[in-house]
């Protein structure tokens, strides 16, 4: 359920507020609906960077749970093949705040277009 993914993103944002994480993350800020699955997989990969950089058990557990929820939601959509989409490394690098903002935006795209 994508709303549960949103809930975990809110938890992550709450948890990182007191931390100083300098990482920049590959971020898709203008998702084309026909590339949303590809973009989501990039977000999930980059989310693991936050987990590693934080060194925080609560963030690690929340990220792990979020990835499971998101992958379950993606698989319930069936095996979607997308072509002509950007590779993760082609995306713009942004700070954690902007990354999470764009992450919420793409999850909302899945909710709104379901």
């Amino acid at each position: 359920n994508w709303v549960n993914v949103i809930s975990d993103l809110k938890k992550i944002e709450d948890l990182i507020q007191s931390m100083h994480i300098d990482a920049t993350l590959y971020t898709e800020s203008d998702v084309h609906p026909s590339c949303k699955v590809t973009a989501m997989k990039c977000f999930l990969l980059e989310l693991q960077v936050i987990s590693l950089e934080s060194g925080d058990a609560s963030i690690h557990d929340t990220v792990e749970n979020l990835i499971i929820l998101a992958n379950n939601s993606l698989s319930s959509n069936g095996n979607v093949t997308e072509s002509g989409c950007k590779e993760c490394e082609e995306l713009e690098e942004k700070n954690i705040k902007e990354f999470l903002q764009s992450f919420v935006h793409i999850v909302q795209m899945f909710i709104n277009t379901s």
Epitope: I6, S7, S29, Q101, S102, N112
Partner: antibody
Framework: QVQLQESGPGLVKPSGTLSLTCAVS?????????WSWVRQPPGKGLEWIGE???????NYNPSLKSRVTISVDKSKNQFSLKLISVTAADTAVYYC????????????WGQGTLVTVSS | SSELTQDPAASVALGQTVRITCQGD??????ASWYQQKPGQAPILVIY???NRPSGIPDRFSGSSSGNTASLTITGAQAEDEADYYC???????????FGGGTKLTVL
Amino acid sequence: QVQLQESGPGLVKPSGTLSLTCAVSGGSISSSNWWSWVRQPPGKGLEWIGEIYHYGYTNYNPSLKSRVTISVDKSKNQFSLKLISVTAADTAVYYCAREGIGWPSFDYWGQGTLVTVSS
Amino acid sequence: SSELTQDPAASVALGQTVRITCQGDTLRNYYASWYQQKPGQAPILVIYGKNNRPSGIPDRFSGSSSGNTASLTITGAQAEDEADYYCNSRDFSGKNLVFGGGTKLTVL
């Protein structure tokens, strides 16, 4: 600076159709944002009507869904609201607004236009 | 019934601090945003996300969230802060946007 401007008739007859347009300037309607209509009956609170994304995706307030259509015209950089079978209860100030990226918010609003439903 | 509940009215003495609250189960999933509306004017976004202020909004406005409650705090209220304040978020399905009923703030 993004600006939004509502336009349309200020008076609509009962059982008629309310039609409004929101012209967007200072930014593109083809941005990553969703675009919404919100209304406010005289002396009452705000009510969300529905939203549209420039690819044509829409979501509507369940209480209005059967009567509402929101559409987008990318060539004119505008989006429109159509509300059918109106009654006096639909009398309100109608606002168009741009949704922010990420967590729920409306970062830009039109100035609003009063639509009265009366014969 | 609204998914977001606000007290209809609040008051604060000039220069004092006031907290306006918004309650709803959906706030466990989503942050709320807050709007100030003065008579005859369109609403203005004052707080969004965890605690973000758009440019031009004074730093006396701040937001916070705990459980199913979001709060807007005005520290050192000014006469010009007298207005209606609305919270906004998504409903439990995530599909629909919702507003609280609004809180009329009087500055004494």
